[in-house]
């Protein structure tokens, strides 16, 4: 009988009382072969997580900046159950850590040296972590001790409890220093209040303190916020302007082995006996004997952790780095406005080659990071890992929704001004053998089907968002009878064709040989009824010009297009006959290296692009014998996006409808990550 | 001006080993990672291994756990260690650095 105990930590001896209590009330409403709670006192939270790190007590519940500390080795923790406040139909589980101004002061990020600054309190999130731990490398040296040299950064500051006699620049807007709503600059108001009076420039504070302290839309008019990538915005565009987006407060457990799913059945069942006005004899959130024991006396309930989500993507990328560099206190030598290399991210072992031969071309200018999957990829660029990779536009889809931004994109046609001119698209086109001639759009059920990879544009967003127009239901392995969809689940009919050896079957890289344009297409000549590619594919391999030996010998006139009316034409009248238009491929990247991801995927293009004559004496950037690696083969340029820099911009509203409606029948478990993220 | 000069090709049966080396004359030679590169005849140039500054290396997948490149930077040179040669690894292999020309290259023909 597998064991349903949930060992939960407190770490008082109030908190012990509360788990006791617990445990007993789950125990009167719970069958005895579902979920139960035991307690493990800690005298400390670090205590906690080292307990169960070792694996003598399950789980806890922390506080952000010990999620941080849960997840670094060798305690490696991860968040698995969030708390949520406000309502159940729009439940908060992140405030966002903003930096607020005054709309006439006309300075930026950027400029913040030699402003004066208000915060909630020393050593607070919001007020003091975050906007210092991002500030830190500007700051001057030394930059120990920190309250020093944060004092010499701004011209004067109220850091509530703060040492006013050591430090008495920090308490110069508020005499004392005062730690507690006796001094009126005290906390998130009080932040906010320092502002307003004009005593500071800028107030550290969460987005939420502007709208409670000022409930008229045309007060609030008056500020803005400071974003990182030195523009402002109003106050209410605080998830697109903001320092860092912080969890309030969530359940970690082991990362192997953790239990995720029994504390998730416990924590669920819990709520629904004991959650908010649920109950008079236990509350999960209330404290009668203290404050916010076990969980916040605030929660409205909980929310279950995405399981693709470790902590590193739990507390993003800002948060992470601000807390960072506050622990580690390491900054480049000497900031210089010089791009660092940009570290490219590789699928699987033949991209990696490439982008190895590419960095050894680029003089240092590009590094190489692995990954095994398109999304393990985006994950790498969000935490930091990685920086850029081009994408197909299904994952240019993901990659935004995950806070990524579009920075240049793969243009396929020569023209004079190749750079400056990005196209409208591309054609998603279904193609059949010509022998096949019963075959139309109207009666593929039931056939073999090869597809590029599950979530890409033209391989399956576009064909299969079209299908489910029809069939209203998500069950395509089902529909077709066999196929070769990679990234599909490995016991689905839509693994069955491919080709991939041992582990590599169905995998979406090029470990799989149907993986990909030119492999869906390959699925097609070898196995398959339809393939689902871009208007190119078929020309580009076929009449010899993919010497491999399954491609060698055929002929485009053999081929033709399924059209959605029910007819067929031949492959070159793909103008008139495709299933839509789709984004080209395009360059993503995190907001802060889009400058620099900008210049030098610029240079790098101008040495390695198309205008290199012969590709067998000189590296080439987009060449790689038909398996598109790193960019598609038939690329002629990066071009600038112009205004279209987000992925919404980019994609446009059609596309992102598109995969928006095909949302409900994703399998992408990063998608489902970043959405829990935001919304 | 730093030249390549590639050495140690030759005939050899299947199964068999051979050494060669990448010598440059001049200095700066491979600061940025050196790559070996062979040619069969009517194919393409194709990477085979490289090694850069830091000592990190990487194969095509057809020679991984067959070939081995090395550096020794006071010597100026750059070894691919052949073991376990099959026919298909018959071809002309140079060796490159960024900036620098392809050298003439040593012939490399593996008899079956």
């Known amino acids: 009988v597998p064991d349903k105990t949930v060992r939960w930590c407190a770490v008082s001896e109030h908190e012990a009382t509360k788990c006791q209590s617990f445990r007993d009330h789950m125990k009167s409403v719970i069958p005895s072969d579902g979920p139960s709670v035991a307690c493990v006192k800690k005298a400390s939270y670090l205590d906690c997580i080292r307990a169960i790190a070792a694996n003598e007590a399950d789980a806890v519940t922390l506080d952000a900046g010990l999620v941080y500390d849960a997840y670094l080795a060798p305690n490696n923790l991860k968040p698995v159950v969030a708390e949520f406040y406000g309502s159940k139909e729009d439940p908060q589980t992140f405030y966002y850590a903003v930096a607020v101004v005054k709309k006439d002061s006309g300075f930026q990020m950027n400029q913040l040296r030699g402003k004066k600054s208000c915060h909630t309190g020393l050593g607070r999130s919001a007020g003091w972590n975050i906007p210092i731990g991002l500030l830190y490398c500007d700051l001057p040296e030394p930059r120990k001790p920190l309250e020093k040299a944060v004092a010499n950064f701004f011209s004067g500051s109220c850091a509530p409890c703060a040492d006013g006699t050591d430090f008495p620049q920090l308490c110069q807007l508020c005499p004392g220093c005062g730690c507690s709503t006796l001094n009126q600059y005290f906390g998130y108001s009080g932040a906010f209040k320092c502002l307003k009076d004009g005593a500071g420039d800028v107030a550290f504070v969460k987005h939420s303190t502007i709208f409670e302290n000022l409930a008229n839309k045309a007060d609030r008019d008056q500020y803005e916020l400071l974003c990182l990538d030195n523009t402002r915005k109003p106050v209410d565009e605080y998830k697109d302007c903001h320092l860092a987006q912080v969890p309030s407060h969530t359940v970690v457990a082991r990362s192997m082995g953790g239990k995720e799913d029994l504390i998730w059945e416990l924590l669920n069942q819990a709520q629904e006996h004991f959650g908010k006005d649920k109950s008079k004899e236990f509350q999960l959130f209330s404290s009668p004997h203290g404050k916010d024991l076990l969980f916040k006396d605030s929660a409205h309930g909980f929310l279950k952790v995405p399981p693709r989500m470790d902590a590193k993507m739990y507390l993003g990328y800002e948060y992470v780095t601000a807390i960072r560099n506050l622990r580690e206190g390491t900054c480049p030598e000497a900031p210089t406005d010089e791009c660092k290399p940009v570290k490219w991210c590789a699928l699987s072992h033949h991209e990696r080659l490439k982008c190895d031969e590419w960095s050894v071309n680029s003089v240092g200018k590009i590094e190489c990071v692995s990954a095994e999957t398109t999304e393990d990829c985006i994950a790498k660029i969000m935490n930091g890992e990685a920086d850029a990779m081009s994408l197909d536009g299904g994952f240019v889809y993901i990659a935004g929704k995950c806070g990524l931004v579009p920075v240049l994109a793969e243009n396929y046609n020569k023209s004079d001004n190749c750079e400056d001119t990005p196209e409208a698209g591309y054609f998603a086109i279904a193609v059949v053998k010509k022998s096949a001639s019963d075959l139309t759009w109207d009666n593929l059920k039931g056939k073999k089907s090869c597809h590029t990879a599950v979530g890409r544009t033209a391989g399956w967003n576009i064909p299969m968002g079209l299908l489910y127009n029809k069939i209203n239901h998500c069950r395509f392995d089902e529909f077709f009878s066999e196929g070769c969809a990679p990234g599909s689940k490995k016991d689905s009919s839509l693994c069955k064709l491919c080709m991939g050896s041992g582990l590599n079957l169905c995998e979406p890289n090029n470990k799989e040989g149907y993986y990909g344009y030119t492999g869906a297409f390959r699925c097609l000549v070898e196995k398959g009824d339809v393939a689902f590619v871009k208007h190119q594919t078929v020309p580009q391999n076929t009449g010899g010009k993919n010497p491999d030996p399954w491609a060698k010998n055929l002929n485009e006139k053999d081929y033709e297009l399924l059209c959605l009316d029910g007819t067929r034409k031949p492959v070159e009248e793909y103008a008139n006959c495709h299933l839509a238009r789709a984004p080209n491929h395009a360059v993503v990247t995190r907001k802060d290296k889009e400058a620099c991801v900008h210049k030098i995927l610029r240079q790098q293009q101008h040495l390695f692009g198309s205008n290199v004559t012969d590709c067998s004496g000189n590296f080439c950037l987009f060449r790689s014998e038909t398996k598109d690696l790193l960019f598609r083969d038939d690329t002629v340029c990066l071009a600038k996006l112009h205004d279209r820099n987000t992925y919404e911009k980019y994609l446009g509203e059609e596309y992102v409808k598109a995969v928006g409606n095909l949302r409900k029948c994703s399998t992408s478990s990063l998608l489902e990550a970043c959405t829990f993220r935001r919304p | 001006q730093v030249k390549l000069e590639e050495s140690g090709g030759g005939l050899v049966q299947a199964g068999g080993s051979l050494r060669l080396s990448c010598v440059a004359s001049?200095?700066?030679?491979?600061?940025?990672?050196v790559i070996w590169y062979r040619q069969a005849p009517g194919k393409q140039r194709e990477l085979v291994a490289l090694?850069?500054?830091?000592?990190?290396?990487n194969y095509r997948e057809s020679v991984k756990g067959r070939f081995t490149i090395s550096r020794d930077d006071a010597k100026n040179t750059v070894w691919l260690q052949m073991n376990a040669l099959e026919p298909e690894d018959t071809g002309v292999y140079y060796c490159?650095?960024?900036?620098?020309?392809f050298g003439q290259g040593t012939q490399v023909t593996v008899s079956s």
């Open positions: 001049g200095s700066g030679f491979g600061v940025n990672g």
């Open positions: 490159k650095t960024p900036g620098v020309p």
């Open positions: 090694i850069k500054s830091d000592g990190y290396t």
